[in-house]
Interface confidence: low
């Protein structure tokens, strides 16, 4: 039961991470205009994302503009877009693989195969989490670097947007979920002889493995 619980928790966290990644990548809140310094001349807030930028006027009116040409976009933005899309697809694949090998599904009967499938799913989700982290950390690094760079016009200094924080949380959830799925896979054991008197099959991953629960912690 313990490993089933871990599986469910891992998958739940991964689903939340996937949703967080989706929202983070879609929202135009990666960079927010920083109202600091003394060269801000426009009474508005600028939100920038991977796909569009939005201007919120002091009146509350918001106008969003999708970036025109893919070729005219900075390479780091194109890379961030690509990594986000790949991470989302990879996380989705990881979840599908996890469901296939989950204890509570009958897609695969063989316990050993199930364990390997869940381990694979965990690794995929860990990788997806890392892929989310890369553009989020890169963007944050660029913002912080510009923020303290005296050469950057004060008017163009940005603050870390909500999408970055959400991205960090989503990456953490994906990696935590993936890590938990990896942990549900038991260490290889020496197969015990099946005594005719005992009448039980080879211990499965569902908790009766002969290992104390504390060994999983």
């Amino acid at each position: 039961m313990a490993s089933t619980g871990l599986e469910l928790l891992g998958m739940t966290l991964a689903v939340l991470g996937w949703l967080g990644t989706l929202v983070s990548c879609a929202l135009p809140l990666w960079k927010v205009t920083a109202f600091i310094g003394n060269s801000i001349v426009v009474a508005q807030v600028v939100w920038e994302g991977l796909w569009m930028s939005c201007v919120v006027q002091s009146t509350g009116q918001m106008q969003c503009k999708v970036y025109d040409s893919l070729l005219a976009l900075p390479q780091d933005l194109q890379a961030a877009r690509a990594l986000c899309v790949i991470a989302l697809l990879l996380a989705l694949l990881g979840l599908l693989v996890a469901i296939t090998g989950a204890q509570c599904t009958t897609c695969v009967e063989d316990e050993g195969a199930k364990a390997r499938i869940v381990l694979t799913a965990g690794v995929i989700l860990l990788l997806a989490g890392i892929l989310v982290l890369i553009p989020v950390c890169w963007t944050a690094h660029a913002i912080i670097q510009d923020f303290y760079n005296p050469l950057v016009a004060e008017a163009l200094k940005r603050e870390l947007g909500a999408s970055l924080y959400l991205g960090w949380a989503a990456a953490a959830l994906l990696m935590l979920g993936g890590g938990l799925l990896c942990c549900t896979c038991p260490p290889p054991q020496v197969e015990r002889p099946r005594g005719p008197r005992l009448g039980y099959s080879i211990p499965s991953r569902s908790g009766a493995s002969g290992l104390d629960k504390r060994d999983y912690v």
């Epitope: 801000i40 426009v42 920038e48 950057v152 016009a153 163009l156």
Partner: antibody
Framework: EVQLVESGGGLVQPGGSLKLSCAAS????????MSWVRQTADRGLELVAS????????YYPDSMKGRFTISRDNAKNTLYLQLSSLQPEDTALYYC?????????????WGQGTSLTVSS | QIVLTQSPAIMSASLGERVTMTCTAS???????LHWYQQKPGSSPKLWIY???TLASGVPARFSGSGSGTSYSLTISSMEAEDAATYYC?????????FGGGTKLEIK
């Protein structure tokens, strides 16, 4: 219709002072950032100073700091540029420009300019 | 400071001809911080293209802008008499904001 009309230019001796004005109409002046930009035949266009909508923040490129002061009177819909310790190289056509309605600090509207000549 | 170099400084084109002028920055500029202005003799500059490729209000569709990093360009698909003017690029990516030296476009 947005209109910006500069005034106050003229002939000034080196070391002298002058105050340029820019009267704005056709838009809500108090909601928009403004700039002064100057133009000469040899140096082209140069940003002189910027000010935010309420006058609380100003910006001067390093080359302009100290001798120029930008200010505004939102009640009178007027932008000002105080020039002091004028030098012959300050001879230029001075424009006021408005950051009206787009995102990235482009100057949407410009006045017709006022000419300043610094000469003895 | 970022130096914007426009080329050619002067160019002439026949009516109906395709025209391209370039603006090269001394270091990388965000495409969202690069703008173009048009100025005719005796008049003040007018915002023509902002954020690299967005045409300002009233600008004919024959104009277009593109570029990224250090290289930007303004293109007129079919030159018309009213397009004869000087075009300036402008960046507000790094302090101080700077303008290019201009490209004067004449009718051949």
């Amino acid at each position: 219709e947005v209109q910006l009309v500069e005034s106050g230019g003229g002939l000034v001796q080196p070391g002298g002072s002058l105050k340029l004005s820019c009267a704005a109409s056709g838009f809500t002046f108090s909601s928009h950032g403004m700039s002064w930009v100057r133009q000469t035949a040899d140096r082209g266009l140069e940003l002189v100073a910027s000010i935010n909508s309420n006058g609380g923040r100003t910006y001067y490129p390093d080359s302009m700091k100290g001798r120029f002061t930008i200010s505004r009177d939102n009640a009178k819909n007027t932008l000002y540029l105080q020039l002091s310790s004028l030098q012959p190289e300050d001879t230029a056509l001075y424009y006021c420009a408005c950051y009206y309605d787009n995102t990235y600090y482009a100057m949407d509207y410009w006045g017709q300019g006022t000419s300043l000549t610094v000469s003895s | 400071q970022i130096v914007l170099t426009q080329s050619p400084a002067i160019m002439s084109a026949s009516l109906g001809e395709r025209v391209t002028m370039t603006c090269t920055a001394s270091s990388s500029v965000s495409s969202s911080s690069l703008h173009w202005y048009q100025q005719k003799p005796g008049s003040s500059p007018k915002l023509w293209i902002y954020t690299t490729s967005t045409l300002a209000s009233g600008v004919p569709a024959r104009f277009s802008g593109s570029g990224s990093g250090t290289s930007y360009s303004l293109t007129i698909s079919s030159m018309e008499a009213e397009d004869a003017a000087t075009y300036y690029c402008h960046q507000y990516h790094r302090s101080p904001p700077t303008f290019g030296g201009g490209t004067k476009l004449e009718i051949k």
